[in-house]
């Protein structure tokens, strides 16, 4: 297992609709054809898996059905979008990238993106 550098923004604020997007960029040492991207969430000393996708270079990322993640890839960059977030989902979201094929296997883990989620205020009663 060889180490690889992964960069991601330090802070992102989710939209009022609970959507957060950020770029995960990895310094590929070789010509990987198969890449696996996993998003982890660290909160309250627990690390949980948010979503994961394996893709072939040049192809779209495919997440599982009912995943809260979507994404696109461009070269060594992965554009990740997480939907349906609520205030309780605030936390550090870590991008983990694995170069699966061809060998050698490379692993890179970013420092994490702190995603802040603020639940929208309920609309006041209106006469209109």
């Amino acid at each position: 297992c060889k180490a690889m550098h992964v960069a991601q923004p330090a802070v992102v604020l989710a939209s009022s609709r609970g959507i957060a997007s950020f770029v995960c960029e990895y310094a590929s040492p070789g010509k990987a054809t198969e890449v696996r991207v996993t998003v982890l969430r660290q909160a309250d000393s627990q690390v949980t898996e948010v979503c994961a996708a394996t893709y072939m270079m040049g192809n779209e990322l495919t997440f599982l059905d009912d995943s809260i993640c979507t994404g696109t890839s461009s070269g060594n960059q992965v554009n990740l979008t997480i939907q349906g977030l609520r205030a309780m989902d605030t936390g550090l979201y870590i991008c983990k990238v694995e170069l699966m094929y061809p060998p050698p296997y490379y692993l890179g883990i970013g420092n994490g993106t702190q995603i802040y989620v603020i639940d929208p205020e309920p609309c006041p009663d209106s006469d209109f």
Epitope: R36, T38, L40, R41, D44, Q46, V47, T48, E49, V50, C51, A52, L64, D66, S67, I68, G84, M88, D89
Partner: antibody, heavy 123, light 106 residues
């Protein structure tokens, strides 16, 4: 159809380690998480840990130092290892299929369970 | 951790009777599951995502609730429903189960 089957040693001596294998069929380990739950005789259910579709693990913090979960996707097998067993670890150990990740749009359930494997810790 | 308290612990009920058991959490929950376990058997999923009926489960079972208060209802008790019922939360790790409600045939 979906099936999970646990296989374990049955009897374990105190301070020894436990290894249980969960062999699954009817679904892929890359599309679902596998959750481990135990039940001491006459008592309730206790969640031990999970290995998610992506291969990341999460453990019950009370047991984290003694637990290890891994899997072999190609063999459709999930492995639970637990160290330093004591008599209060005597229980029925279950594996169950569940959500692939911790945060989903829907589908929060352990929908299929194995028949369980009985583990008795005794000298 | 999020502690789930089920009540009552033991509940006698007659065939045809409406049965409601509750599950109370120490902090707010988004999704709750309910499981049925009969003596000597593995748990069986009844309700997922708080109110959705699992495949093959009779429509007499229903789940509801929000925040910290959830319930499982059996509209008309049948003899085969005698079992222990567990609630389980998905909102925080570690995942936790309630201690169970034992439903007995009166």
């Amino acid at each position: 159809q979906v099936q999970l089957k646990e296989s374990g040693p049955g009897l374990v001596a105190p301070s020894q380690s436990l290894s249980i294998t969960c062999t699954v069929s009817g679904f892929s380990l890359t599309s679902y998480g596998v959750y481990w739950v135990r039940q001491p005789p006459g008592k309730g259910l206790e969640w031990l840990g999970v290995i998610w579709a992506g291969g990341t693990t999460n453990y019950n913090s009370a047991l984290m130092s003694r637990l290890s979960i891994s899997k072999d996707n190609s063999k459709s097998q999930v492995f639970l290892k637990m160290s330093s067993l004591q008599t209060d670890d005597t229980a029925m150990y279950y594996c169950a299929r569940g959500p692939p990740h911790a945060m989903m749009k829907r589908g929060y359930a352990m929908d299929y369970w194995g028949q369980g494997t009985s583990v008795i810790v005794s000298s | 951790q999020n502690v789930l308290t089920q009540s009552p612990a033991i509940m006698p009920a007659s065939p045809g009777e409406k049965v409601t058991m509750t599950c109370s959490a120490t902090s707010s929950i988004t999704y709750m599951s309910w499981y049925q376990q009969k003596s000597g058997s593995s748990p069986r999923l009844l309700i997922y995502d708080t109110s959705n009926l699992a495949s093959g489960v009779p429509v007499r079972f229903s789940g509801s609730g929000s925040g910290t208060s959830y319930s499982l209802t059996i509209s008309r008790m049948e003899a085969e429903d005698a079992a222990t019922y567990y609630c389980q939360q998905w909102s925080s790790y570690p995942l936790t189960f309630g201690a169970g409600t034992k439903l007995e045939l009166k």
